[in-house]
Every structure is written in C-alpha cells, then in structure tokens.
C-alpha cells in the first residue's frame, strides 16, 4: 500500500500562519479572514521510523506540489529547505532521513524535530514575516511549538 498522507495546516504558538515566500521558502506571519487562504497546506505522510505514543515520524510535503521540507548541512549548519522531488516516487513509506521529522506532542505543545539532526526543530521567529528555519534551541526566543489543523482532502 502507498503511504497514508493527510492534509493539514500549521500555526506557531503565537498564532502565526505559514505561507510561501518565493518558490523555495516559507515564512510565518499573522493572517486573518480571507488572507487565511494564503496559508500553506501540507500533505503530512506517516512514514517509517521509530515511533512512540508522543512521537510519530512524518514527512511534510506541500499539497499538490512536488516539494518537501528537508534538513541538510549548509556551511556545516543544519538547515531547513524546500526540496523538489520526482512526484512518481514520492511520497513513500521509507523516506530518506533528511525528509523525516519526529512529530512530538507533549502537554499541548507540538514540535517537529529533524530525524537527521536530533534536537534541531522547525522554528519561527518572534518577528513577523521572517523565514521558517531549523533551530537548535528550545525554550529560547525562537518558537518551536505549533498547533496543527487537519483539513479534508
């Protein structure tokens, strides 16, 4: 069977939504009303990996696009990017590790930890209109907590 994928949107703990910023970047900003339609819809795939009650391995693609969030080293630093893939081969159950995030939910807080780089998390800045990035700090200035809204296909 193919991998099961469900559509969802994400908001950070400051209620900022995620939108496209150019072809290969996401940014976080507050949206209201009709502007909410700009937010990115992810296709979240339940992929192979170590799993527990609080931790589920997922891949985050952009709905109906052949783009996936991935984690790679750039200038020796773990970095978040949007990577183009061959739609004939993705998504799949055994995703390469750079595409895998551990979706961790504890006490109303949802985090996305890179499987490739443990303790590095999908992050947003406190400031408006800044890029979504991979951050190595939890509980600091940058935001690593999200809420998730599943949406019908």
């Amino acid at each position: 069977a193919p991998v099961r994928s469900l559509n969802c949107t994400l908001r950070d703990s400051q209620q900022k939504s995620l939108v496209m910023s150019g072809p290969y970047e996401l940014k976080a900003l507050h949206l209201q009303g009709q502007d909410m339609e700009q937010q990115v819809v992810f296709s979240m795939s339940f992929v192979q990996g170590e799993e527990s009650n609080d931790k589920i391995p997922v891949a985050l693609g952009l709905k109906e696009k052949n783009l996936y969030l991935s984690c790679v080293l750039k200038d020796d630093k773990p970095t978040l990017q949007l990577e183009s893939v061959d739609p004939k081969n993705y998504p799949k159950k055994k995703m390469e590790k750079r595409f895998v995030f551990n979706k961790i939910e504890i006490n109303n807080k949802l985090e996305f930890e890179s499987a490739q780089f443990p303790n590095w998390y999908i992050s947003t800045s406190q400031a408006e209109n800044m890029p979504v990035f991979l951050g190595g700090t939890k509980g600091g200035q940058d935001i690593t907590d999200f809420t998730m809204q599943f949406v019908s296909s």
């Epitope: 069977a1 193919p2 099961r4 994928s5 469900l6 559509n7 969802c8 339940f46 009650n53 609080d54 589920i56 939910e105 504890i106 006490n107 109303n108 807080k109 949802l110 907590d145 999200f146 809420t147 998730m148 809204q149 599943f150 949406v151 019908s152 296909s153």
Partner: antibody, heavy 119, light 107 residues
Framework: EVQLVESGGGVVQPGRSLRLSCSAS????????MSWVRQAPGKGLEWVAY????????YYPDSVKGRFTISRDNSKNTLFLQMDSLRPEDTGVYYC????????????WGQGTPVTVSS | GIQMTQSPSSLSASVGDRVTITCRAS??????LTWYQQTPGKAPKLLIY???TLADGVPSRFSGSGSGTDYTFTISSLQPEDIATYYC?????????FGQGTKLQIT
C-alpha cells in the same frame, strides 16, 4: 473499567449554543486522541470533531467547521464540544469516542447524549 | 471525500446462518477499514479494524476481508445477540466516513 460518560445534551433553539462534556475513566486519558461522533435520528454515523492527545491537533469536517470547537482538560480527564450557531440538522445523539486521525478508528464509545435543535 | 456504500441495507437470516455484508469505497482505501456493531439503543462497538483484525474480546465467528475498494464482513454462524446494525468506516484520507449501515434481523 474503561468508560466514557457524556453529558450536556438537551433541547436548544436554532442559532443558540450548547456545550457537551465527556468524562473518561479507566485509562490514561492524556495518552489518547479523542473524537465526537454524532448520529441523526434513524440515520448513520458522522465524525464531527477530533483532538489529539495533548490538544495541539484538531479536525472538523466541513459540515461543522467554524461552528464547533473541541477541547480537552487532561488534568480532569474531560473532553468538551462547544457547539455554536446550531442548526436543525445538528439534531442527533452525540457520542464521545476514543480514537481519531492517526489510529483512524474508535475503540471505546460513550453511551451518547441527545441534542435537539428546534424552535 | 471517499464515499462508503454498504449492501444490503437490511437483511434477515436464521440462527446458525452464515451472513455476509459488503462495503464498497468510491476509491482505493488500502485496507484502512473498520467494522462496528450497534445494537438498538446502544453505542457502536468496534469489531474489526484494518479490514481483518479482530478487536479485543470479539468472538471469532466475526471476520473481515477485502482490499482495494471492496470489503466483506462475515458472521460464520449467526447468534441471537448479533441482531444489530453494522457499519463500515474507512480511515484512508480525511474525512473518514461511515457506510449507511446494514440492519440485520432474525427470521
């Protein structure tokens, strides 16, 4: 014994609000995703709301989106459904159920609480 | 979304009979299917998940099979306590939807 007990149902006029509660016992509530499923009189089943075990994930079908809000208090082992702008078609028995998006099926159900929306 | 169609909508059978209910999905659901039993005036009860896995405590006379879009629920030897309405439900893609139900009566 694993148990879910709903309360808060009743008769309400169209456009008004109602808040349902579900008290859980016999299992570690904070480890389980939870849902509300409804059944219109003499009809089938419809999944109307989902919340993840910690409360950070939710889902609503289009039929109730923007009108219903699911929430939970893990410290009190209680699930809630806030129903606003109620319509006659929201009439039915509302069941609290264990399970949701990830597992996909509902393995424990409450006895249900009836909701009637009528002028 | 994916629509689930059960057949028949109702059926009568005798104690000891083999009973079969089918459920057809409007798209491939890859065995992400469950079956529930709802006796009159009661809440639904999970019987089968993942198309063929029996839930805890469910008697072995109940079974499920199928793949793709077509699924079957079987009671190998009907018992009086099996009088109920049976529902299928898929969980492949959102929204997860239920079939309209099959009402089983004893002749």
């Amino acid at each position: 014994e694993v148990q879910l007990v709903e309360s808060g149902g009743g008769v309400v006029q169209p456009g008004r609000s109602l808040r349902l509660s579900c008290s859980a016992s016999g299992f570690i509530f904070s480890k389980y995703d939870m849902s509300w499923v409804r059944q219109a009189p003499g009809k089938g089943l419809e999944w109307v709301a989902y919340i993840s075990h910690g409360g950070a994930g939710t889902y609503y079908p289009d039929s109730v989106k923007g009108r219903f809000t699911i929430s939970r208090d893990n410290s009190k082992n209680t699930l809630f459904l806030q129903m606003d702008s109620l319509r006659p078609e929201d009439t039915g028995v509302y069941y609290c159920a264990r399970g949701g998006v990830y597992k996909g099926y509902f393995d424990v159900w409450g006895q249900g609480t009836p909701v009637t929306v009528s002028s | 979304g994916i629509q689930m169609t059960q057949s028949p909508s109702s059926l009568s059978a005798s104690v000891g009979d083999r009973v079969t209910i089918t459920c057809r999905a409007s798209g491939n659901i890859y065995t992400y299917l469950t079956w529930y039993q709802q006796t009159p005036g009661k809440a639904p009860k999970l019987l089968i998940y993942n198309a063929k896995t029996l839930a805890d405590g469910v008697p072995s006379r109940f079974s499920g099979s199928g793949s793709g879009t077509d699924y079957t629920f079987t009671i190998s030897s009907l018992q009086p306590e099996d009088i109920a309405t049976y529902y299928c439900q898929h969980f492949w893609t959102l929204p997860y939807t239920f079939g309209q139900g099959t009402k089983l009566q004893i002749t």
